[in-house]
Interface confidence: low
């Protein structure tokens, strides 16, 4: 039975040209995390495997940095980075958990962090 919950930093915003940390946390389960995938819509950004470590998709290597922790740092943001990001936790024995973060990249200099809340 899957008892865990993915909790995230929620809806966030950042300035064009800046950087942002995407962070998820798997709670309420003691299942073993074997791998975490980070995806943007249908594109794979990065993988963190418990045994093999990090792999960044070649097309994002210049702008994506692993961490902190199981999170992902996006750099040199453009307005095209606006959209949904997903953290996909592969666990044993529970199975797969998915969390969602919406990032808005703003042109102005007044970008602030949005509300931080749990994604249902």
């Amino acid at each position: 039975m899957m008892t865990g919950t993915i909790e995230t930093t929620g809806n966030i915003s950042a300035e064009k040209g800046g950087s942002i940390i995407l962070q998820c946390h798997l709670s309420s389960t003691t299942a073993q995390v074997t791998q975490v995938n980070w995806e943007q819509q249908d594109q794979l950004l990065a993988i963190c495997n418990a045994d093999l470590g990090w792999h960044i998709s070649p097309s994002f290597k210049d702008r994506v940095a692993p961490g902190p922790g199981l999170g992902l740092t996006l750099q040199s943001l453009t307005v095209n980075d606006t959209g949904e990001y997903f953290c996909i936790y592969h666990t044993y024995p529970d199975g797969t958990y998915t969390g969602r973060i919406f990032l808005e990249v703003l042109e102005s200099s007044v970008a602030e962090h949005g509300a931080r809340f749990q994604i249902p």
């Epitope: 962070q23 946390h25 995390v33 963190c48 418990a50 902190p68 922790g69 999170g71």
Partner: nanobody
């Protein structure tokens, strides 16, 4: 290798308070989570609370409003302030870190809530 040592457990009356500490050696606060689980006699280990270096905190519904988790990055220490304790909070409390991405566990500290 990360090592975690919990302290602060003990016997307390219902309604009382305790503060648990978790001292970590190694690079445990490199942007990751620290948190607490607990295991009551005859039950499975359950998550209690987590804190992210940036200040994000999360709590299990059963402890919201009564427990507060915090971390002192300069001391590599996490804390769990437990107020309004109930008999059902009786358990061994374990510190955990995901600073490198994957959980490490402490040995646990026993909290007994009884009159």
């Amino acid at each position: 290798e990360v090592q975690l040592v919990e302290s602060g457990g003990g016997l307390v009356q219902p309604g009382g308070s305790l503060r648990l500490s978790c001292a970590a050696s190694g690079n445990t606060f490199s942007g990751g989570f620290m948190g607490w689980f607990r295991q009551a006699p005859g039950k499975e280990r359950e998550w209690v609370a987590s804190v992210l270096r940036g200040g994000y905190t999360w709590y299990a519904d059963s402890v919201k409003g009564r427990f507060t988790i915090s971390a002192d990055n300069s001391k590599n220490t996490a804390y769990l302030q437990m107020n309004s304790l109930k008999p059902e909070d009786t358990a061994v409390y374990y510190c955990t870190t995901e600073g490198s991405g994957w959980r490490n566990w402490g040995q646990g500290t026993l909290v007994t809530v009884s009159s």
